[in-house]
Interface confidence: medium
């Protein structure tokens, strides 16, 4: 069974998938469609790297531009370095500026909804 066929079988169960499962899926050539990606738990999507999302979505990564203002894509963008987002070639904006440090202050993030940044 190839990655796409496997994805079809598990698609209906993915809504509650944890980050670890999504990372594993990204290595299996599944080409997750955007409708499914948009239904994933935000907290599961946030830790994914740009490279992992690109591998997870396959051709559908090109559709991220259309969803950049919607969760979980919007929140995921806020967590990525702008340099990394730029490598997607989709014009996604809102990432962490170059030279900033990201502090994983979970309480601060829970209150504000955004990561804490320290300037250069």
């Amino acid at each position: 069974m190839n990655g796409s066929e496997y994805f079809v079988k598990i698609q209906s169960f993915l809504g509650g998938a944890p980050t670890e499962d999504l990372k594993a899926l990204s290595q299996q050539n599944v080409s997750m469609d955007l409708a499914t990606f948009m239904k994933l738990r935000t907290d599961a999507v946030l830790p994914l790297t740009v490279a992992e999302v690109q591998k997870l979505l396959g051709p559908h990564v090109e559709g991220l531009k259309a969803e950049e203002r919607h969760r979980p894509v919007r929140d995921w963008i806020l967590r990525q370095r702008q340099d990394d987002l730029d490598t997607l070639g989709l014009g996604l904006q809102g990432g962490i500026p170059n030279g900033y440090l990201v502090l994983d202050l979970s309480m601060q993030e829970a209150l504000s909804g955004t990561p804490c940044l320290l300037g250069p």
Partner: antibody, heavy 120, light 107 residues
Framework: EVQLVQSGAEVKKPGASVKVSCKAS????????MHWVRQAPGQGLEWMGN????????NYNEKFKNRVTITVDKSASTAYMELSSLRSEDTAVYYC?????????????WGQGTLVTVSS | DIVMTQSPDSLAVSLGERATINCKAS??????IAWYQQKPGQSPKALIY???YRYSGVPDRFSGSGSGTDFTLTISSLQAEDVAVYYC?????????FGGGTKVEIK
Amino acid sequence: EVQLVQSGAEVKKPGASVKVSCKASGYTFTSYWMHWVRQAPGQGLEWMGNVNPSNGGSNYNEKFKNRVTITVDKSASTAYMELSSLRSEDTAVYYCAPHYIGSRPGFAYWGQGTLVTVSS
Amino acid sequence: DIVMTQSPDSLAVSLGERATINCKASQNVGTNIAWYQQKPGQSPKALIYSASYRYSGVPDRFSGSGSGTDFTLTISSLQAEDVAVYYCQQYNSYPLTFGGGTKVEIK
């Protein structure tokens, strides 16, 4: 208005290479991936590959993987498709087409096509 | 690779009558399908995306339906300018693939 202007027709000998250009205007070139599709005379459409204009990353159809190279010149908003080791069956019209422009998937815009004739 | 099989290869329909083109994917592609119209000597023109959504400017006599593996393009009332070859295409996974085309003519 989105416009894709391709280079002119080419006649090549078997074993030679051809490089077709596609100049884009009317949209942010680096925000959308550029794809190449070919069509042999009287035949259907065949996807060759695409390129991420931001970093030059590409995906290729395995059928062409060792013979095709898709590149971009960001400063000129131009994409290129080079096909090497030409044979008679490569005689076709070659099209460039960006995907997902305006948030809708699919190839909404196409270049005018470049006829490449391979003949001894 | 996902194989897209179109049927019929050609279709002759009277003006004002309905034309129906089928496209079958070799595996589930959700609704990640587009339809194109190509007239002789021209570049393809996009008609439908996501299986059932018309691109702006496409007449409402064109409609698409289906999901999974079976898809249909319907021209509800054929006009003379609809004579062309129609292609389906999946963008669910690489490599992107097209159907072989269906030639629509006037009976």
